[in-house]
């Protein structure tokens, strides 16, 4: 998270951290007592690792009394993604059990109504992804808000051009921006999933390359079909 | 299908003012911008302005600033320009265009002839 | 605003000769988040332009491989391997990354 702040401790008990071998590799939300949903193309990045999925932790490296870590029983990433885009870019991920849920670790209600959220809206992102361009890694978890940013400016020439399809949703980036390592986490509109950061290799922070998130009501029929 | 529909061709008079529209389909009408664009009879082209059909906020090239007014009807997917005091130098075809990607979808052009 | 100079103004091809456009702009088009912005349009007769090339390399899709794209800063350049007789036409080269955009002022490519 680019320009934001630490994260009020456990206060985002949704939170999921999705690890290779033991690092933090992508964001990821809980969305049922054994499924967090996160993005597609983080598996890419993770080649023949062990993927685990962390619950209930605000510090990576420090014990904390609700941290969890789950093996992950499967893997399911949307059918139609694929490496070279950022359509679809969704993964459910099944916990080798179900979560024990509690104060630091609860499921986030999502969106399953397919309508746009209204421009200028301010959501919250959260992750531990970089917080510099230098790429320094946080330890904590960080949080910033964003702006909604209308589709037809998001897909301006000087934007994203036309890579923006109704699946998909924009936030600004002005300074303040999601970056690597927040794929698969979470954005949140007024305490409902609207969006799950895509991983893509955007530049982060620059206003002319707003962030990009898949919408999930525009999913809801598959996430009910996996999660069923 | 993306198609842009132009309004057809116009002769005015001169003093007087003109309004053709830009009828899209095949898409959601307020993902992307609609531009504008000029061109003389065997001239190149030159670009008017752009509108954002969510909020109807608009750029214009300084030179079109008071001559060209872009406007938008969401209800029925349609970008409108108005062209006023229009003189022979505005005779033209007027082109709309999408952007994203690019100017990759135009309309066929709207031939404007002011003539007394 | 970015002036776009074209040369040459009209260029005679044989079909299957190769044919070259230069597009040359008064300052740097590259946009402040380190794109270029440099497109190529093609315009036949009596219709709208077609996009050929974006981001000074890209084909669009559709566009045939015989058409490339290069350059950088303020020159660049359209070739064209094999010209077909459905290549005829003006073309036109935009700069996007300054407002307002800026034409070039065309090449008719036709027949020698």
């Known amino acids: 998270i680019l320009g934001g702040r630490e994260a009020e401790a456990h206060a985002r008990p949704y939170m999921a951290s999705v690890q290779v071998n033991g690092e933090h590799l992508c964001g990821g939300v809980l969305v049922a007592e054994q499924w967090v949903l996160s993005a597609a193309h983080c598996l890419e990045d993770a080649a023949d690792g062990k993927v685990q999925v962390l619950l209930g932790a605000h510090s990576l490296s420090q014990p904390e009394p609700s941290k969890r870590l789950y093996d992950v029983l499967r893997a399911v990433p949307h059918p139609d993604s694929r490496p070279d885009t950022i359509d679809h870019d969704l993964l459910l991920l099944q916990l080798s059990e179900k979560a024990t849920l509690g104060p630091a670790v609860r499921p986030l209600p999502w969106q399953r109504v397919d309508r746009d959220v209204e421009p200028g809206t301010l959501c919250d992102v959260a992750g531990w992804g970089i917080v510099s361009h230098a790429g320094r890694r946080p330890d904590r978890l960080q949080h910033v808000l964003l702006p909604v940013l209308d589709r037809a400016t998001c897909n301006r020439r000087t934007h994203h051009d036309g890579a923006i399809t109704q699946r998909m949703m924009c936030a600004e980036s002005n300074r303040r921006d999601s970056c690597k390592g927040d794929s698969g986490g979470p954005l949140v509109c007024g305490g409902v999933l609207e969006g799950v950061v895509t991983s893509g290799s955007r530049v982060c922070g620059n206003r002319k390359k707003p962030g990009i998130y898949t919408r999930v009501a525009s999913y809801a029929a598959w996430i009910d079909s996996v999660l069923a | 299908e993306v198609q842009l529909q132009q309004s057809g061709p116009e002769l005015v008079k001169p003093g007087a003012s003109v309004k053709i529209s830009c009828k899209a389909s095949?898409?959601?009408?307020?993902?992307?911008?609609k531009n504008w664009m000029r061109q003389r009879h065997g001239e190149s082209l030159e670009w008017i302005g752009d509108?954002?059909?969510?909020?109807?906020?608009?750029n214009y090239n300084q030179k079109f600033k008071g001559k060209a007014t872009l406007t938008v009807d969401k209800s029925s997917s349609t970008a409108y320009m108005e062209l006023r005091s229009l003189t022979s130098e505005d005779s033209a075809v007027y082109f709309c265009?999408?952007?994203?990607?690019?100017?990759?979808?135009w309309g066929h052009g709207t031939l404007v002839t002011v003539s007394a | 605003d970015v002036l776009m100079t074209q040369t040459p103004l009209s260029l005679p091809v044989s079909l299957g000769d190769q044919a070259s456009i230069s597009c040359r702009s008064s300052?740097?088009?590259?946009?402040?988040?380190?794109?270029?912005?440099l497109e190529w349009y093609l315009q036949k007769p009596g219709q709208s332009p077609n996009l050929l090339i974006y981001?000074?390399?890209n084909r669009f899709s559709g566009v045939p491989d015989r058409f490339s794209g290069s350059g950088s800063g303020t020159d660049f350049t359209l070739k064209i391997s094999r010209v077909e007789a459905e290549d005829l036409g003006v073309y036109y080269c935009?700069?996007?990354?300054?407002?307002?955009?800026?034409f070039g002022g065309g090449t008719k490519l036709e027949i020698k």
């Open positions: 935009f700069q996007g990354s300054h407002v307002p955009p800026t």
């Open positions: 300052q740097t088009i590259v946009h402040s988040n380190g794109d270029t912005y």
């Open positions: 509108i954002n059909p969510n909020n109807g906020d608009a």
């Open positions: 265009a999408r952007e994203g990607p690019s100017f990759a979808y």
């Open positions: 981001k000074v390399s």
């Open positions: 095949g898409y959601t009408f307020t993902d992307y911008y």
